[in-house]
């Protein structure tokens, strides 16, 4: 018995059958297959698979494999069967199935397709027309993410200089793994003349908060107290602030990084929801001081992509000295 079992482990199994590929949503590619015909009866089947470039090797008992990938180029999966989870075991002959991107002139596809998730409330995507495109092309953007039942078409197409774009509502769902997923994007034209372009936007990457809103500036001795309203939708551990103070007399430009801070000093309007406060030390009250603030996401919540919010509106306090 033991010998037979040992033989079935070293003996190469027949190849898998009926390997097929399909696309779900916009960018979810799914391969399915059937077990090999004539596999050893005492073999517990496992399937070895990897993509064409030998990436993402996987050994699993399931007869399917999926990947979320922008379908801008051909992608192939090779699958074989074996009797153990051992990667060194030689699998059966590998069967390959590929899927190609939609037809079309590659020069007609839009370029620089990118999206930013603004304040966790709406996503704004933009792109440049392809080189072989007529100037009057009417673009359509389609999007899908896990909380949508079907693919949606973006309605708000706009033009900004050379760029085209579209924005759609995308609100963070509280208490869920919403942000661990991605938004799938496709841009094509209404007439079907251009090659569609795809993108996958992880919801942990390109996040741009709204600018803070300065509510109050006040002096206490030689300290400047700044109070502002935080952008909505974010939890406190995910944001930090850059407070910039410019002094007209000394022409100094001081920058402070600030953690979201409670308004506990008597100088501040206290217990106002969603506000933060900061004390700038050693500021001259008899000179004009101009403050502005911007905010950035923390890399432990959202991937580092250097996206600060826009600056808040400036607010000034103090008086400008006459240059006599």
């Amino acid at each position: 018995d033991y010998k037979d079992d040992d033989e079935s482990r070293t003996e190469t199994q027949p190849p898998v059958t009926n390997l097929s590929v399909s696309v779900e949503n916009l960018c979810t590619v799914i391969w399915t297959w059937n077990p090999p015909e004539g596999a050893s009866s005492n073999c517990s089947l496992w399937y070895f698979s990897h993509f064409g470039d030998k990436q993402d090797k996987k050994i699993a008992p399931e007869t399917r494999r999926s990947i979320e990938v922008p379908l801008n180029e051909r992608i192939c999966l090779q699958v074989g069967s074996q009797c153990s989870t051992n990667e060194s075991e030689k699998p059966s002959i590998l069967v390959e199935k590929c899927i190609s991107p939609p037809e079309g002139d590659p020069e007609s596809a839009v370029t620089e397709l990118q999206c930013i998730w603004h304040n966790l409330s709406y996503m704004k995507c933009s792109w440049l027309p392809g080189r072989n495109t007529s100037p009057d092309t009417n673009y359509t953007l389609y999007y899908w993410h896990r909380s949508l039942e079907k693919i949606h078409q973006c309605e708000n197409i706009f033009r900004e200089g050379q760029y085209f774009g579209c924005s759609f509502d995308l609100t963070k769902v509280k208490d869920s793994s919403f942000e661990q997923h991605s938004v799938q994007i496709m841009v094509k034209d209404n007439a079907g003349k251009i090659k569609p372009s795809f993108n996958i936007v992880p919801l942990t990457s390109r996040v741009k908060p709204d600018p803070p809103h300065i509510k109050n500036l006040s002096f206490h001795n030689d300290d400047l107290y700044v109070q502002w309203e935080n952008p909505q939708n974010f939890i406190s551990r995910c944001l930090f602030y850059e407070v910039e103070v410019n002094n007209s007399q000394t022409e100094t430009h001081n920058v402070f990084y600030v953690q979201e801070a409670k308004c506990e000093n008597p100088e501040f309007e206290r217990n106002v929801e969603n506000t933060s406060c900061f004390m700038v030390p050693g500021v001259l009250p008899d000179t004009l001081n101009t403050v502005r603030i911007r905010v950035k996401t923390n890399k432990l919540c959202y991937e580092d992509d250097k996206l600060w919010s826009n600056w808040s509106q400036e607010m000034s306090i103090g008086k400008k000295r006459n240059s006599t």
Epitope: I235, S236, R237, C238, L239, F240, E242, V255, Y257, Q259, E260, A261, K262, K296, N298, K299, L300, D304, D305, K306
Partner: antibody
Framework: EVQLVQSGAEVKKPGESLKISCKGS????????IGWVRQMPGKGLEWMGV????????RYSPSFQGQVTISADKSISTAYLQWSSLKASDTAMYYC???????????WGQGTLVTVSS | EIVLTQSPGTLSLSPGERATLSCRAS???????LAWYQQKPGQAPRLLIY???SRATGIPDRFSGSGSGTDFTLTISRLEPEDFAVYYC?????FGQGTKVEIK
């Protein structure tokens, strides 16, 4: 004044469990991350992971995921680092650190020396 | 995963000289996240610079940080006897391997 005070040195045998502590004072404990940094004898600094005591959200460095557990008790402003089964290679100085959201480690505990030897 | 590489490994200088320490990231990082630390034997490290160029509280102005993208620099304009130590750069979960500044 911001202070992070760590528990004392420990000498343990391989396979034993251990929990070391770090008590924060002089600031709002729930508004900053607390992290742990390892320094093996004569070596550099290694970031192990962090916890945000406000909601107990934790993040581990891939090298330490599953090897240690970071926790916090905000009622007593204390963070913990624990091992369920120590190895000789865990012998090191462990520092607790305060981390604001921009990721720098602005205050450090005095360090806890852990020695694991049979 | 981002790798931070510090150079040189050891810098031998005399008091009063200028020290220039380099930290190179394997890919572009936001300067907001880059920090520098000093560690003396038997002591915990201390923060010198955060956000690539902002001095931490109580740090003398002979210490300055600069750089962006993948290349960052810590400069000590005139070395004092107490500045001989090991210096580390850091970005969230990654530290450089350290540069030792020793007396020549």
């Amino acid at each position: 004044e911001v202070q992070l005070v760590q528990s004392g040195a420990e000498v343990k045998k391989p396979g034993e469990s251990l929990k070391i502590s770090c008590k924060g004072s002089g600031y709002s404990f729930t508004s900053y991350w607390i992290g742990w940094v390892r320094q093996m004898p004569g070596k550099g600094l290694e970031w192990m992971g962090v916890i945000y005591p406000g909601d107990s959200y934790t993040r581990y460095s891939p090298s330490f995921q599953g090897q240690v557990t970071i926790s916090a008790d905000k009622s007593i402003s204390t963070a913990y680092l624990q091992w369920s089964s120590l190895k000789a290679s865990d012998t090191a100085m462990y520092y607790c650190v305060r981390m604001p959201n921009w990721g720098s480690l602005d205050h450090w505990g005095q360090g806890t020396l852990v020695t694991v030897s049979s | 995963e981002i790798v931070l590489t510090q150079s040189p490994g050891t810098l031998s200088l005399s008091p009063g000289e200028r020290a220039t320490l380099s930290c190179r990231a394997s890919q572009s990082i936001s300067s907001s996240y880059l920090a520098w630390y000093q560690q003396k034997p038997g002591q915990a490290p201390r923060l010198l610079i955060y956000g690539a160029s902002s001095r931490a509280t109580g740090i003398p102005d002979r210490f300055s940080g600069s750089g962006s993208g993948t290349d960052f620099t810590l400069t000590i304009s005139r070395l004092e006897p107490e500045d001989f130590a090991v210096y580390y750069c850091q970005q969230y979960e990654t530290f450089g391997q350290g540069t030792k500044v020793e007396i020549k």
